[in-house]
Interface confidence: low
């Protein structure tokens, strides 16, 4: 069956370059026109570029024209997107997409590859407790959590009690701070009565910086 | 370029409902219109092409219609698998233009948020920064307003919000709002409060603490 497998994404500084690849299988690559489409975090789909099956014609969205170059290598069954002079607004998941045999819509898509354009360097998070108190108790239920702050790039994973605690957990999507670093919170609601007896530990893993933190969260002692 | 406008941007519905999404083109595109479904973290999936032709393997509850500038995608009886974001795309001209998307979410019953406030930890204060977190837990619908007040003075521009995806079990949302200050600014003030307004609350709820007190 038709498969499009993408590679080449990653973190790059503004003004630098990156090359994305889209390796095709399951069809005669040289006969098909393939496009690039991108999706900025939390946003809609934006068409980026296309190259004809015979390589004679290339077409680009205004937003990337002059900076991005599309190419293909039929002997390797691979389509490329060379991205130069990258800008923060180019941060997106990039998809390659193949048209239907005789029609100009996208019947087959790659899995997507994330490109992050930022001047930030890889940095592990600081993990701070969100301690339960009378201000975070409501009707026999207490809330507690961890603030995972100032890391780059995405993602981090957060579990509670090494995965044993899943009920009542909310790990929020990360927000990008003005510093260019990410921050998120993970919270859990538990019975107030358990605070003195049960141990609550958030387990934070940031693979890009090889950072692992286990933070015990307990009521603030006064 | 041809511009595509989808409406609504969000649609709340229940399983079994008949739902309709509209897509308008800024100029006639004949029937050169495709519809795609996208789920979080996944690539889009083709549903419909040529405005009304169903892609192979797509259930017949998806119905496309329209020509010229007005198009609709109807799901005749919404199934659990159909909660997703839908995009229209014109392929009349070569800068393949997509609509901005329509998110079909589960229609829940009104639920007021539980509100909690967390002061900055001593560990964080040692680093020179103070983050105050306000948590709104398990509410519906998604629209909620959080206002920060410091010594009763309204704050703006120094907080960020994040909202979870809709919970698959109870259809609620949760929200965190983080007020970020320098340690020096934090220590200049005493009362920190977050005020929450939501359809499920008869009046705004305020949670607060006095800096330095338990």
């Amino acid at each position: 069956q038709v498969q499009l497998v993408q590679s080449g994404g990653g973190v790059v500084q503004p003004g630098r370059s990156l090359r994305l690849s889209c390796a095709a299988s399951g069809f005669t690559f040289s006969r098909y026109t393939i496009h690039w489409v991108r999706q900025a975090p939390g946003k809609g789909l934006e068409w980026v570029a296309v190259m004809s099956y015979n390589g004679n014609n290339k077409h680009y969205a205004d937003s990337v024209n002059g900076r991005f170059t599309i190419s293909r290598n039929d002997s390797k069954n691979t389509l490329y997107l060379n991205m130069n002079s990258l800008r923060p607004e180019d941060t997106a998941v990039y998809y390659c997409a193949r048209i239907r045999d005789t029609a100009m819509f996208f019947a087959h898509w790659g899995q997507g590859t994330l490109v992050t354009v930022s001047s930030a360097s890889t940095k592990g998070p600081s993990v701070f407790p969100l301690a339960p108190s009378s201000k975070s108790t409501s009707g026999g239920t207490a809330a507690l959590g961890c603030l995972v702050k100032d890391y780059f790039p995405e993602p981090v994973t957060v579990s509670w009690n090494s995965g044993a605690l899943t009920s009542g957990v909310h790990t929020f999507p990360a927000v990008l701070q003005s510093s260019g670093l990410y921050s998120l919170s993970s919270v859990v609601t538990v019975p107030s009565s358990s605070l003195g007896t049960q141990t609550y530990i958030c387990n934070v893993n940031h693979k890009p910086s090889n950072t692992k933190v286990d933070k015990k969260v307990e009521p603030k002692s006064c | 370029d041809i511009q595509m406008t989808q409406s609504p941007s969000t649609l709340s519905a229940s399983v079994g409902d008949r739902v309709t999404i509209t897509c308008r083109a800024s100029q006639s595109i004949n029937t050169w219109l495709a519809w795609y479904q996208q789920k979080p973290g996944k690539a889009p999936k083709l549903l419909m092409y040529k405005a009304s032709s169903l892609e192979s393997g797509v259930p017949s509850r998806f119905i496309g219609s329209g020509s010229g500038t007005e198009f609709t995608l109807t799901i005749s009886s919404l199934q659990p698998d159909d909660f997703a974001t839908y995009y229209c795309q014109q392929y009349n001209s070569d800068s393949k233009m997509f609509g901005q998307g329509t998110k079909v979410e589960v229609k829940g019953t009104v639920a007021a948020p539980s509100v909690f406030i967390f002061p900055p930890s001593d560990e964080q204060l040692k680093s020179g920064t103070a983050s105050v977190v306000c948590l709104l837990n398990n509410f519906y619908p998604r629209e909620a307003k959080v206002q920060w007040k410091v010594d009763n003075a309204l704050q703006s521009g120094n907080s960020q919000e994040s909202v979870t995806e809709q919970d698959s079990k109870d259809s609620t949302y949760s929200l965190s709002s983080t007020l970020t200050l320098s340690k020096a600014d934090y220590e200049k003030h005493k009362v920190y409060a977050c005020e929450v307004t939501h359809q499920g609350l008869s009046s705004p709820v305020t949670k607060s603490f006095n800096r330095g007190e338990c």
């Epitope: 026109t33 190259m51 099956y53 015979n54 048209i99 005789t102 100009m104 | 392929y91 070569d94």
Partner: nanobody
């Protein structure tokens, strides 16, 4: 203003062939989808075939599939419609279109 000029129409016996050409006045069309439409007397204009800007992707009305072939020569700013196995019901004025632009049309008559 882009000018599109069709040629190649005429009278042909049923079962015969014709090749229509549509020349554009500039390179506008080389980066746009090109299409052929037709309009028979007393009927609405209908889609016949289209080719994407690269020439790499084509689409046909069911009524002409397997008989008509659309192609494009970007170097010559020209799109072609090769019409084989013509039927009386193919008789119409044939128009080419690019983006918002239309040609003047060329008459195709098929005698039985």
């Amino acid at each position: 203003q882009v000018q599109l000029q069709e040629s190649g129409g005429g009278l042909v016996q049923a079962g015969g062939s014709l090749r229509l050409s549509c020349a554009a006045s500039d390179r506008y069309f080389s980066s746009h989808t090109m299409a052929w439409f037709r309009q028979a007397p007393g009927k609405e204009r209908e889609f016949v075939a289209r080719v994407d800007w690269s020439g790499g992707s084509t689409e046909y009305a069911d009524s002409v599939k397997g008989r008509f072939t659309i192609s494009k020569d970007n170097a010559k700013n020209t799109v072609y419609l090769q019409m084989d196995s013509l039927k009386p019901e193919d008789a119409a004025v044939y128009y080419c279109a690019a983006g918002p632009y239309w040609g003047q049309g060329t008459q195709v008559t098929v005698s039985s």
